[in-house]
Each structure stands twice: as C-alpha cells, then as structure tokens.
C-alpha cells in the first residue's frame, strides 16, 4: 500500500507534514514521526530549547538559544539575583535582598561597622574603638588630644 503525500503507517492513518510556524517546528521521519528542528522540543516541537546553562527556574526562552530572565534575576544564565536597589556592600540569595558583607551594616549595607579598620583615623599612636555604624572613638596617648589625637 502506497500512502498519499504526508500519510504514513499501516493503513496510512498517521499524518505528518513538516512545518515551521506557531504550531510547531518539525520535519517528519520515514515513519511519520515528528522530528523537531534544532533548538525545538516537545510533543509538537513548539517549545524552544534555551541557552545551555539557562536556569530552568529563573530563565526561559521563546526562541532557541535565548535565556530571558524572570523579574528579579539577571546574568547570562538568569542565575544571579538582583539585589535591593542601592545595596552597596551586600549580596542577595533571593531578589531584592541586601545581605551585608562582613563589617558592613544598615539596610543598604552602607554603614561601616569597622570604621577603625577601614579608615585608621586615630593618629599619633591613638587606640581606635568601633562604637557603632560609621562611629569610632580614639583613646589618645599622653600628650595628645582631639577626636583623632591630632592635637
């Protein structure tokens, strides 16, 4: 039995005609099975295969090889969260977080908790103590005074 064009199988009861449009992107094998074009997958070959490494959780694509990030995610593979706007010395595990690095505090991680170590403000052998975010106190040796033992 010879089947009409695009019909396959015993009894010619399977239809497959190649297409490359909204409904699918496929060719047909000798048995009438759809064989997806490169970059496409799914039963109807209408689901794009994203860039290799594209986060399955936070990235997606409508065209093969693409990787479009969900809101709050960034990077080539959409695997990097976007921290809170204005976050200075912080990172995120989830979008819009600002988790401060060591010795930084405040909502935007812009307050120095180790002012003494970062700026070494005490002069003339003064001893520096961190007293709060962006705050310090100098204990001056005998013969020196002033906020930074500069006098």
């Amino acid at each position: 039995v010879t089947c009409d064009d695009y019909y396959y199988g015993f009894g010619c009861n399977k239809f497959c005609r190649p297409r490359d449009d909204f409904f699918g992107h496929y060719a047909c094998d000798q048995n009438g099975n759809k064989t997806c074009m490169e970059g496409w997958m799914g039963p109807e070959c209408n689901r794009a295969i994203c860039r290799q490494g594209c986060s399955p959780k936070h990235g997606s694509c409508k065209l093969p090889g693409d990787c479009r990030c969900q809101y709050g995610w960034q990077g080539l593979y959409c695997d990097k969260c976007i921290p809170h706007p204005g976050c200075v010395h912080g990172i995120c595990n989830e979008p819009w977080q600002c988790l401060c690095e060591t010795n930084w505090g405040g909502q935007l991680c812009d307050k120095d908790l180790n002012y003494c170590g970062t700026h070494q403000p005490c002069l003339n052998g003064g001893t520096c103590s961190n007293t709060g975010p962006d705050k310090y106190q100098c204990s001056c040796p005998e013969g020196y005074s002033g906020p930074n033992c500069e006098i």
Epitope: Y6, Y7, C12, D21, F22, G24, G42, P43, E44, R47
Partner: antibody, heavy 116, light 107 residues
Amino acid sequence: QVQLVQSGAELKKPGASVKVSCKVSGYAFTDYAIHWIRQAPGQGLEWMGIINTYYGDSKYAQKFQGRVTMTVDTSTSTAYMELSSLRSEDTAVYYCARGYDGFAYWGQGTLVTVSS
Amino acid sequence: DIQMTQSPSSLSASVGDRVTITCRTSENIYSYLTWYQQKPGKAPKLLVYNAKILAAGVPSRFSGSGSGTDFTLTISSLQPEDFATYYCQHHYDIPWTFGGGTKLEIK
C-alpha cells in the same frame, strides 16, 4: 482520563466583561494548546483563538481582537478566556478545547447570556 | 482568512442511506481538515482529522477524503444515532475557521 471542566453559566449586562475558566486534568497542561470556540443559539461554531499554554502566547480571530484576552495559570492547569464590552450578540455557549490536529477533547461549555 | 463552504446546509435521509457532505476551502490547506459531529446541547465530537484519519472510537461507516481545497465526509450506511449536525474545520493557519454546518435529518 483527559478532562476539561469549565466554569458555570453567567448572566451579564451589555458593556460588562465575562471571564470563563477551563480546568484541565489527565495530561501535562503545558504540552497542548487550548482553543476557545463559541456557538450562538441555533448557530454554527466560531473559532475565537488559541493560547500556547507553555508560553502564554495567544492568537485571536480578527473579529475578537481587542476584546478578548486568553490567559493560563500553569500552577492550577487552568485556561481563561475574558471577553469585554459585551453585547447581546455575544450570547453564546463558550467552549474550550484541546488539540493541534483537530479537537479531540472539549469542555462541557459555558452559557454566557448578555441581557439588560 | 480561509473561507469554508460546506454543502448542503441541510439534508434529509433515511436509515441505511449513504450520505456525502462536502467542504470546499478558498485556498489550499493540504490535509489540515477536521470533521465534527454535534448533537443538540452537547459539545462537538471529533470524527475525522487530517482529512481522512478516523478518530479513536468512531465507527468505520464514517470516512473522510480529499486534500487541497475539496473534502468529503461520507457515512456509508446511516444509523439512527447519526442524525446530527456536521461541521468541517481547517487547522492550517490562524484563524481555524469552521464551515457553516450540515444538519442531517430523518426523512
């Protein structure tokens, strides 16, 4: 088994909007597109549009462009069809259906009546 | 848009008759044509898809033929349960338009 279960009948006033739901079960929701078809009393079938359930992309018949919105909620395997600026001619049974090579599976239909 | 012309719009026939319904399209749709049967108050039922493939569970007295622009649905020997309205529909490109329907009534 594959099932498409639609929301109940609606009575709407002219100018209002209606949103019909179609909850599917028995297969992977994002594997197949959902179509919406309507049938006015005593009339034939009219294709309204299709939505790709994986991406949420939709294509509408020109007649409904600007008035119809098709959406999906993949978390509940539900498709929605919203028709706005209703008029009396929109009184019809609205069906959702699944398929690419014709519609093997249909919802039971939702009667939408538009009357003042 | 592709226009679907279905004929006849109504048809009277008797049990045991051979019945043919035709559908003509305004442009080549290859074999992207489907036939449905609808009974009052029910959703349509898929009979034939891709012009000539019988859907699962459909009796063999139904058959479809044609390609390009001219298509036919044939019921070889009408049964009482076949009296209904029949629709063709193309699924070649958007929009997937339907034919106007053929109401098959008992003579």
